[in-house]
């Protein structure tokens, strides 16, 4: 059963390592894949002394942990590298960190990347 599923056909693309990887630095990435597989967008970033440094953004292969996520939100507490994935065109344009712990109150830090 699949409820209210949003198709992902393209994602915001960014690669901080673009020169070494010989890719574009930024743009829109069309998401390809088998027709029976779902596609997602993702973002990875670091928080260096309070400054957000985007590592990569783009398309992400079919991954059940990305299903039904309309927003790109990292919820893991204090990760080394932040990661989120989502479904829907360009859903990785905005990403946020919203740590959810069992006892403490979560705080929201939305991020709008400006590569």
């Amino acid at each position: 059963a699949i409820l209210g599923r949003s198709e992902t056909q393209e994602c915001l693309f960014f690669n901080a390592n673009w020169e070494k990887d010989r890719t574009n630095q930024t743009g829109v990435e069309p998401c390809y894949g088998d027709k029976d597989k779902r596609r997602h967008c993702f973002a990875t970033w670091k928080n260096i002394s309070g400054s957000i440094e985007i590592v990569k953004q783009g398309c992400w292969l079919d991954d059940i942990n990305c299903y039904d996520r309309t927003d790109c939100v990292e919820k893991k507490d204090s990760p080394e590298v932040y990661f989120c994935c989502c479904e829907g065109n360009m859903c990785n344009e905005k990403f946020s960190y919203f740590p959810e712990m069992e006892v403490t109150q979560p705080t929201s830090n939305p991020v709008t990347p400006k590569p």
């Epitope: 059963a1 699949i2 409820l3 209210g4 599923r5 894949g33 088998d34 029976d36 597989k37 779902r38 292969l61 079919d62 991954d63 059940i64 942990n65 990305c66 299903y67 039904d68 996520r69 919820k75 893991k76 990661f83 994935c85 959810e100 712990m101 069992e102």
Partner: antibody, heavy 118, light 111 residues
Framework: EVQLLESGGGLVQPGGSLRLSCAAS????????MSWVRQAPGKGLEWVSS????????YYTDSVKGRFTVSRDNSRNTLYLQMNSLRAEDTAVYYC???????????WGQGTLVTVSS | QTVVTQEPSFSVSPGGTVTLTCGFN?????????PSWYQQTPGQAPRTLIY???TRSSGVPDRFSGSILGNKAALTITGAQADDESDYYC??????????FGGGTKLTVLG
């Protein structure tokens, strides 16, 4: 520490029903897809069912479709497997597993035994 | 119906190297199937060894490594030890929510 604790197993007659529960702690339950995996006595592991973070998408192996229903209560940090019309071949240890990015099972419960016999 | 195949059994000498493989009937295994590997000893829950083809799970010794060999996923154990004697399962993620387990390989460490 991540903990998954299954309960609800037991002896049931063919055609009967059981509801398994998996109580999760030590991680943000509502941020993880979850699965049920079973193992018949002396046999290998078999994926049974998975559910997305919201519960909006559910998936089953062919042999349990229409008989088993997976669900979750994110406010109670609990995963469920409702098993109806049970058959002898459903006899197995049922494991609850947390699913992480790259769709792999990163944590497992200790399992609960379901025996279907008359 | 997708069938994932593993060697039913394998033997290795202590200190030796063994490579277990995981293929399927519908074509080649690639990284897009996120191959993962699990170890299980009798009466115990499975333990996660490798995910995303070649990433070791936390606490797993570097004697265990994952790869793609030809058209199959592979788990290599170097410097095999007595307590590596276990059942090993691979899992392929077929997409659209579906996971498929291999039949498992029973690994015997000789001696």
């Amino acid at each position: 520490e991540v903990q998954l604790l299954e309960s609800g197993g037991g002896l049931v007659q063919p055609g009967g029903s059981l509801r398994l529960s998996c109580a999760a702690s030590g991680f943000t339950f509502r941020n993880s897809a979850m699965s049920w995996v079973r193992q018949a006595p002396g046999k290998g592991l078999e994926w049974v069912s998975s559910i997305s973070v919201t519960g909006g998408s559910t998936y089953y192996t062919d042999s349990v479709k229409g008989r088993f229903t997976v669900s979750r209560d994110n406010s109670r940090n609990t995963l469920y497997l409702q098993m109806n019309s049970l058959r002898a071949e459903d006899t197995a240890v049922y494991y609850c597993a947390k699913v992480y990015y790259y769709s792999f099972f990163d944590y497992w419960g200790q399992g609960t035994l379901v025996t279907v016999s008359s | 119906q997708t069938v994932v195949t593993q060697e039913p059994s394998f033997s290795v000498s202590p200190g030796g190297t063994v490579t277990l493989t995981c293929g399927f009937n519908s074509g080649s295994v690639s990284t897009s199937y996120y191959p993962s590997w699990y170890q299980q000893t009798p009466g115990q829950a499975p333990r996660t060894l490798i995910y995303n083809t070649n990433t070791r799970s936390s606490g797993v010794p570097d004697r265990f490594s994952g790869s793609i060999l030809g058209n199959k996923a592979a788990l290599t154990i170097t410097g095999a030890q007595a307590d590596d004697e276990s059942d090993y399962y691979c899992v392929l993620y077929m997409g659209s929510g579906i996971h498929v387990f291999g039949g498992g390989t029973k690994l015997t460490v000789l001696g």
